[in-house]
Interface confidence: low
């Protein structure tokens, strides 16, 4: 397993609809044809897997049907979107990239993107 550099933004603010997008960029040491991208969430020293996708270079990312993630790839960049976020989902979202094929196998883990989620204020009752 060889190390690989992965870059991602330090901070992202989710939209009022609970959607956060960020770019995960990796420095590919060779010409990978198959790449796996995994988003991990770190909160209170606990790390959980949010979603994962595998794709062939130049093709769409394929997340599981019930995944909260979607994404597109362009070269060595992956544009990730996480949906359905609420305030309790605020945390550090880490991008993990694996170059699966051809060998050798490379693994890169980003420093994480702190995603802040603020639940929208409920609309006040109208007196009119």
């Amino acid at each position: 397993c060889k190390a690989m550099h992965v870059a991602q933004p330090a901070v992202v603010l989710a939209s009022s609809r609970g959607i956060a997008s960020f770019v995960c960029e990796y420095a590919s040491p060779g010409k990978a044809t198959e790449v796996r991208v995994t988003v991990l969430r770190q909160a209170d020293s606990q790390v959980t897997e949010v979603c994962a996708a595998t794709y062939m270079m130049g093709n769409e990312l394929t997340f599981l049907d019930d995944s909260i993630c979607t994404g597109t790839s362009s070269g060595n960049q992956v544009n990730l979107t996480i949906q359905g976020l609420r305030a309790m989902d605020t945390g550090l979202y880490i991008c993990k990239v694996e170059l699966m094929y051809p060998p050798p196998y490379y693994l890169g883990i980003g420093n994480g993107t702190q995603i802040y989620v603020i639940d929208p204020e409920p609309c006040p009752d109208s007196d009119f």
Partner: antibody, heavy 120, light 107 residues
């Protein structure tokens, strides 16, 4: 509805080359993300993954058998062909082909399998 | 290659029993594990993928769990049609290795 069917000789002699054909329907190997793999199972033994070919002609092989395996596809005929050289009695097994979609790393549809016996 | 081991290799159980099969990976494979059921003379049938996701059409008495190096397949209430051999398969990195199998037989 996805179906796959393996065909080829039931008996081959040691040192000969085995050629197996997987004929499928219900999907196309020209569709992005689609792959067809081969798995074998000696009598009473576990499954062994052999090879995979994808829509873009990307190929993967089991390292222990790579030097003996060739995998090709004929998109127009909906066929995948596996060849294994220098057959040995230990290669006696049921050979299966199976469908796989990129990003979902499992085989969701399998052929019925074909038993190949290697004996002189 | 990633090695998979299964326990037990043979299991004798009765209809209605709760059955648990364990699969260990020689290195961490996250949740990239599938479970298959195989009956004599038949091709394997996918039961569970991504360690815990039930394949469409598979009865809900089957469930999977685990992550990393240890995974389990559970049959909550064994039915007559469940007597078969069960295989785990890692799909984390090539080659996609299978476990040695667990045969579930009638007690």
């Amino acid at each position: 509805q996805i179906t796959l069917k393996e065909s080829g000789p039931t008996l081959v002699k040691p040192t000969q080359t085995l050629t197996l054909t997987c004929t499928f329907s219900g999907f196309s190997l020209s569709t992005s993300g689609v792959g067809v793999g081969w798995i074998r199972q000696p009598p009473g033994v576990a499954l062994e993954w052999l090879a995979l070919i994808y829509w873009n002609d990307d190929k993967r092989f089991s390292p222990s058998l790579k030097s003996r395996l060739t995998i090709t596809k004929d998109t127009s005929k909906n066929q995948v062909v596996l060849t294994m050289t220098n057959m040995d009695p230990v290669d006696t097994a049921t050979y299966y082909c199976a469908h796989r979609r990129l990003g979902l790393y499992y085989f969701d549809y399998w052929g019925q399998g074909t038993l190949v016996t290697v004996s002189s | 290659d990633i090695q998979l081991t299964q326990s037990p290799s043979f299991l004798s159980a009765s209809v209605g029993d709760r059955v648990t099969i364990t699969c260990w990976a020689s290195q961490g494979i996250s949740s990239y594990l599938a479970w298959y059921q195989q009956k004599p003379g038949k091709a394997p049938k996918l039961l569970i993928y991504a360690a815990s996701t039930l394949q469409s059409g598979v009865p809900s008495r089957f469930s999977g769990s685990g992550s990393g190096t240890e995974f389990t397949l559970t049959i909550s209430s064994l039915q007559p049609e469940d007597f078969a051999t069960y295989y785990c398969q890692q799909v984390h990195i090539y080659p996609f290795t299978f476990g040695p199998g667990t045969k579930v037989d009638i007690k």
